[in-house]
Interface confidence: low
């Protein structure tokens, strides 16, 4: 038979509610979404969890839940509560979680919250709260999580927070707060997470974050800040900082000097024009740094002490040179994007042994020296498009065994070194108008995509089947030797008979196709024939 206590459990389940034991001889009661307009009356004294969410409860009477001394979680979210009277939660000595979100409260129910000494989590989000009385949280000594987001607050309730020394996480996001005064969170020494995103914050007191000794996450995204939040300097444990989508125009020197633990900084979608050269120094945990369009930056940042950076993006600035020691500071760099700058001369990147991707397109680079990219054993992608490169040392790419993508389009090349590039799958040379010679497919056994300056240069890559048949001109009077075209078929162009020529061409195509199928552009056609095929020499 069942014990008297389990009998009490069974009898304590209100009509239509769902009840089940919680494994500790206590009862979980779910009365959510039942259209209730008042609290059920026959609740078991042994109830530990009570969910009354999504009902039509518009008021609570004083002491509506008598004797529920074991109740740990009470959910009243999604009702029509506009006011909670004194004594509404009297006797709930074990209450740890109270959910009042999605109601119509206009201020924090101060008297109702008094003496909930065990309360750890309080949800007041998605109400209409515009006022937080100074003493409203004074008895909540155990409170760890507080939700006040999505309300109508216009200022930080500084006094109300004074008593919350155990608070670990708080969100004030999605309110109408416009300023954070000095010492706004002065006593919140245990706070780890603070969300202030989606407010109207335009100014911060210089000491507004003083006292937040444990803060690890600060979210100021989507506000109206027009100055860098220098008040963060006191946040020595800060790991994640967001201030994207504001109106900040500059990041000062030594901006994060007080935040050596930063792992993540989100600051995109700001009109940042200037960044102090020392702004990102001494951030050993920072892995990614992205800064696009800061047009007033003329010098590469000094990243001393930020040695674990794995990805650096600094585009659309006016950087004209890089320090020779750039890789000494950044030994762990995997991705480097310095596109859309004014770089002319490049240092040797060989100390950046972990580099996998380099993007230097749209700069002013004119030469690639032998040591520029030496021994970058992990480099897979190199983009040098839209520069002024006229000279590439013959061995510039000779020690890049992992390189599969190389983009040299829109430069001033008249020749192209092939040494070390046998692993390429993607090669772009389009827009180099002085590069008129042919490139042999034999040198690129892995090639899948190639873009050349001229259509006829694609003929070496087996994409000419239609072109041969359509144009079929082949400079019939041309006496150029074909030795370099295909050793096996050397001399076969001596045949003047058109059928022999066609047979040769078909054989030639089949041989190329057997090697591999390559997508080459611009593809030859009736208006871009292969008639120049004999004008140049294949590069061996």
């Amino acid at each position: 038979g069942s014990s008297p206590r389990s009998g009490v459990l069974l009898r304590g389940c209100p009509t239509h509610c769902h009840c089940e034991p919680d494994g500790r001889m206590l009862l979980r009661v779910d009365c959510s979404d039942l259209g209730l307009s008042e609290l059920p009356s026959n609740l078991s004294v042994f109830t530990s969890y009570l969910d009354l969410s999504m009902n039509n409860i518009s008021q609570l009477l004083p002491n509506p839940l008598p004797s529920l001394r074991f109740l740990e979680e009470l959910r009243l979210a999604g009702n029509a509560l506009t006011y909670i009277p004194k004594g509404a939660f009297t006797g709930l000595y074990s209450l740890k979680v109270l959910m009042l979100q999605n109601n119509q409260l206009r201020h924090v129910p101060t008297e109702a919250l008094q003496n909930l000494r065990s309360l750890q989590s309080l949800r007041l989000d998605a109400n209409h709260i515009s006022y937080v009385p100074p003493s409203c949280f004074s008895g909540l000594h155990s409170l760890r999580h507080l939700w006040l987001d999505d309300n109508a607050l216009t200022e930080i309730p500084v006094q109300a927070f004074r008593s919350l020394s155990a608070l670990q996480a708080m969100t004030l996001a999605l309110n109408k707060i416009h300023h954070i005064p000095d010492y706004a969170f002065g006593n919140l020494s245990s706070l780890v997470v603070l969300h202030l995103h989606n407010n109207r914050i335009h100014s911060l007191g210089k000491k507004c974050f003083d006292g937040l000794h444990s803060l690890e996450t600060l979210d100021l995204n989507y506000n109206n800040l027009d100055e860098f939040p220098t008040a963060i300097r006191t946040l020595s444990n800060l790991k994640e900082l967001g201030f994207h989508s504001n109106n900040i125009r500059s990041i000062p020197e030594k901006a994060f000097v007080g935040n050596p633990s930063l792992i993540t900084i989100h600051f995109y979608d700001n009109p940042i024009q200037f960044v102090g050269r020392s702004a990102f120094q001494h951030l050993p945990e920072l892995r990614t740094l992205t800064l696009n369009g800061a047009s007033q930056i003329t010098e590469f940042p000094d990243l001393t002490g930020t040695a674990n950076l794995e990805s650096l993006t600094l585009t659309g600035a006016q950087i004209s040179s890089l320090p020779q020691t750039v890789c000494n500071q950044l030994p762990n760099l995997q991705v480097l994007d310095l596109s859309y700058n004014l770089l002319e001369d490049l240092p040797s990147f060989s100390v950046c042994q972990k580099l996998q991707k380099i993007d230097l397109r749209h700069n002013e680079i004119y030469e690639i020296k032998v040591d520029t990219f030496q021994q970058l054993l992990s480099l897979r992608s190199l983009n040098l498009a839209w520069n002024k490169i006229a000279i590439i040392h013959p061995n510039a790419f000779s020690t890049l065994p992992s390189l599969i993508k190389l983009d040299l389009s829109s430069n001033l090349l008249s020749s192209f070194p092939i040494t070390g590039l046998h692993g390429l799958t993607h090669l772009k040379l389009t827009g180099n108008h002085a590069l008129q010679s042919l490139i042999s497919s034999e040198n690129f056994p892995e090639l899948k995509v190639i873009e050349m300056p001229y259509a006829y240069q694609c003929c070496a890559f087996g994409v000419c089947e239609n072109a041969y048949k359509i144009s079929n001109q082949w400079n019939k009077g041309d006496n150029s030797s074909m030795d370099d075209l295909h050793k096996k078929d050397a001399g076969m162009f001596q045949a003047q008979d058109e059928r022999d020529l066609e047979d040769f061409l078909l054989d030639f195509e089949e041989d190329l196709k057997a090697l591999h199928s390559v997508q080459c552009s611009p593809s030859p056609g009736p208006f871009k024939p292969c008639e120049h095929l004999l004008d140049g020499w294949l590069i061996r």
Epitope: A173, L174, H197, T217, D219
Partner: antibody
Framework: QVQLVQSGAEVKKPGSSVKVSCKAS????????IGWVRQAPGQGLEWMGG????????KYAQKFQGRVTITADESTSTAYMELSSLRSEDTAVYYC??????????????WGQGTLVTVSS | DIALTQPASVSGSPGQSITISCTGT?????????VHWYQQHPGKAPKLMIY???NRPSGVSNRFSGSKSGNTASLTISGLQAEDEADYYC???????????FGGGTKLTVL
């Protein structure tokens, strides 16, 4: 590259519970919220809730309040979604996804491969 | 109960442009920039195409663009290609219910 790998397909009886796991690769698990979205056969996407692992906050869609529990284990970079009192209309593919900017209103930039849960007697 | 309204289907020929609308209320689409668009091919997980109204994640073609006017967000795909054929979903944040809401989805057919 972030990857979210979910547990395998499940067949459950009405009234029972199912717990789906979602293991994240990469070091930033704690700094991003993980959400759960489901999709019934031939239907659209439906948000169930989400959790911010570094301090255990969970938010749930009103429809699932009380029936869904979302948890996270920082030590294994794994999030869990448990749905109780299953009924036949809970048959769906359940996806976990990462909130790209950390907080709950932001977009899901990485998704798990999905877990098919079939509720049938 | 779908909170955001999308057309059930749209179609276009290769090379054309199409626009998919997503209509909500003042508390979701109308209030914040938290409108996101996803593409989903049959049997696959959704893929983020546009976030925060108009931003494109890296790797997403610039043929995809997003915009918002009042309570309606829009996804425009220009230069339609065969691989664009898929279901498209909008997503928004509802400041009233504090929930994330999806549109019912739009099936795009490339003729």
């Amino acid at each position: 590259q972030v990857q979210l790998v979910q547990s395998g397909a499940e067949v459950k009886k009405p009234g029972s519970s199912v717990k789906v796991s979602c293991k994240a690769s990469g070091r930033t698990f704690s700094n991003y919220a993980i959400g759960w979205v489901r999709q019934a056969p031939g239907q659209g996407l439906e948000w169930m809730g989400g959790i911010r692992p570094n301090f255990g906050w969970a938010k749930y869609a009103q429809k699932f309040q009380g029936r869904v529990t979302i948890t996270a284990d920082e030590s294994t970079s794994t999030a869990y979604m448990e749905l109780s009192s299953l009924r036949s209309e809970d048959t769906a593919v359940y996806y976990c996804a990462r909130y790209g900017q950390g907080h709950f209103p932001s977009a899901f930039d990485y998704w798990g491969q999905g877990t098919l849960v079939t509720v049938s007697s | 109960d779908i909170a955001l309204t999308q057309p059930a289907s749209v179609s276009g020929s290769p090379g054309q442009s199409i626009t998919i609308s997503c209509t909500g209320t003042n508390s979701d689409v109308g209030t914040y920039n938290y409108v996101h668009w996803y593409q989903q091919h049959p049997g696959k997980a959704p893929k983020l195409m546009i976030y925060d109204g108009s931003n494109r994640p890296s790797g997403v073609s610039n043929r995809f663009s997003g915009s918002k006017s009042g309570n309606t967000a829009s996804l425009t795909i220009s230069g339609l290609q065969a691989e664009d054929e898929a279901d498209y979903y909008c997503q928004a944040y509802d400041s009233h219910s504090f929930n994330i809401v999806f549109g019912g989805g739009t099936k795009l057919t490339v003729l």
